[in-house]
């Protein structure tokens, strides 16, 4: 007859081994439960962004649920209703919807509430929170320390926006640093390794044309 491991009852990349009575799942890092069905991310990890309220899930498949404040949605309250469609920021500035107001994050070499002022060099330029002023091509910008952004590095930035987790891993920002919750089948601090080392010899191909030093799309 069929064995208890047929069809692999272990979720999220867990490996199944038969026991005298039934089966046992060995779960990859970040998952647990009889069938590795429970994510290791809980309310203690602070997964709800933008002031969302975290409550424990009612069933084992949902370790937490985020109740989002007005203006935010998504499973982690990470999505905001877009009020930037009118493109109020000039000179390629990035529009930020703060809920109570819109703000422009200006490209290097521009400043002002709507990025309307053209700047030229680092002279007399102060970058806050440990940022350093970088000149180049007639423009300049602040290279900000982790967790800060904006023209002068005065704004709190979301370090997860840079997509630091590989292979579809989900990023969470903590006071002690970033954490990646890996997609099934991957492990490592940044989800860079397949769980099963005896599997495929190559990783999924990188998208063509993207290089680490290139501007991110």
């Amino acid at each position: 007859g069929p064995g208890p491991c047929d069809g692999n009852p272990c979720a999220n990349g867990g490996s199944c081994s038969e026991t005298p009575r039934s089966f046992e799942c060995t779960c990859p890092r970040g998952f647990y439960g009889l069938r590795c069905e429970v994510s290791g991310v809980t309310c203690a990890d602070g997964p709800c962004f933008n002031g969302g309220l975290c409550v424990g899930g009612a069933d084992p498949d949902s370790a937490y649920i985020c109740h989002c404040p007005p203006g935010f949605q998504g499973s982690n309250c990470e999505k905001r209703v877009d009020r930037c469609s009118l493109q109020p920021c000039r000179n390629g500035g990035l529009c930020l919807d703060l809920g109570h107001a819109l703000r422009c994050r200006c490209r290097a070499g521009f400043a002002g509430p709507r990025c309307e002022h053209d700047l030229d060099d680092c002279a007399g330029r102060a970058c806050a929170n440990g940022g350093t002023c970088v000149e180049g091509g007639g423009a300049h910008r602040c290279s900000c320390a982790l967790g800060f952004g904006g023209r002068d590095c005065r704004e709190r930035a979301d370090p997860c926006a840079a997509r630091p987790c590989a292979h579809g891993g989900r990023c969470y920002a903590h006071f002690s640093g970033l954490v990646c919750a890996c997609a099934p089948g991957y492990m490592g601090a940044r989800c860079e390794f397949p769980v099963h080392p005896d599997g495929a010899s190559a990783l999924p191909a990188a998208p063509p044309g993207l290089r680490p030093g290139d501007p991110q799309r």
Epitope: T132, V134, S143, C144, A145, L146, P159, C160, A161, A162, R163, P164, C165, A166, H167, G168, S176, G177, L178, V179, G188, A189, R190, C191, E192, F193, P194, P197, D198, A200, S201, A202, L203, A206, P207, L210, P212, G213, Q216, R217
Partner: antibody, heavy 124, light 113 residues
Framework: QEQLVESGGGLVQPGGSLKLSCKVS????????VSWVRQAPGKGLEWIGY????????YYASWVNGRFTISSHNAQNTLYLQLNSLTAADTATYFC?????????????????WGPGTLVTVSS | DVVMTQTPASVEAAVGGTVTINCQAS??????LSWYQQKPGQPPKLLIY???TLASGVPSRFKGSGSGTQFTLTISDLECADAATYYC???????????????FGGGTEVVVK
């Protein structure tokens, strides 16, 4: 312009200690880490360890065995390599290197920007 | 720890020729293999990462291939400026310490006649 500049190298006696600094600018630690690599005169490259400041993690080659320590001062965009219990075998040029870890969700793990290096000479 | 074995230690070829450098890993390193070029008195320069992707500004005469444990760097249409030492570098999962680590090959000196 992405840049790394090492400093702090010099002559040190066997058994002594030294702290190397690496000033970095022009990139975001969310996607990049910083590695230390050394090269003895006329020899090949040897990886020492790397720091992933965004994740608060530091990794070392097994041969380091606690003698070397990598740390960072994020507010000043400065990385450090503390060298202890030095011997003549540690004489080398020490490079501070940017490592492209995961950029826009894609894992690279390549060392794409190198500092000029700083020479450490261990001799009595 | 993973050991990266690079062959040959030295190779000589004429201008316009082709050189092939091999790099063998002692365990599966997937696609995490980079190649570097180093000239005397200079730091290394990244040529190729993720086995086959050219770094910015590197000419297409440089080609990387392979997967798993066997990797190759091929330099075609050799120029005098290609005379240098070439290193491979892996990133791998260290099961003993449960984290990622890097390792370099011993290097290959390319002499262009």
């Amino acid at each position: 312009q992405e840049q790394l500049v090492e400093s702090g190298g010099g002559l040190v006696q066997p058994g002594g200690s030294l702290k190397l600094s690496c000033k970095v600018s022009g990139f975001d630690f969310s996607n990049y880490g910083v590695s230390w690599v050394r090269q003895a005169p006329g020899k090949g490259l040897e990886w020492i360890g790397y720091i992933d400041p965004a994740f608060g993690r530091t990794y070392y080659a097994s041969w380091v065995n606690g003698r070397f320590t990598i740390s960072s001062h994020n507010a000043q965009n400065t990385l450090y390599l503390q060298l202890n219990s030095l011997t003549a075998a540690d004489t080398a040029t020490y490079f501070c290197v940017r490592v492209a870890l995961v950029v826009a969700g894609v894992a690279y793990y390549g060392m794409d920007v190198w500092g000029p290096g700083t020479l450490v000479t261990v001799s009595s | 720890d993973v050991v990266m074995t690079q062959t040959p230690a030295s190779v000589e070829a004429a201008v316009g020729g082709t050189v092939t450098i091999n790099c063998q890993a002692s365990q599966n390193i997937y696609s995490y293999l980079s190649w570097y070029q180093q000239k005397p008195g200079q730091p290394p320069k990244l040529l190729i990462y993720r086995t086959s992707t050219l770094a910015s500004g590197v000419p297409s005469r440089f080609k990387g291939s392979g997967s798993g444990t066997q990797f190759t760097l091929t330099i075609s249409d050799l120029e005098c400026a290609d005379a240098a030492t070439y290193y491979c570098q892996s990133y791998y999962y260290s099961s003993g310490s449960s984290y990622g680590a890097f390792a370099f090959g011993g290097g290959t000196e390319v002499v262009v006649k």
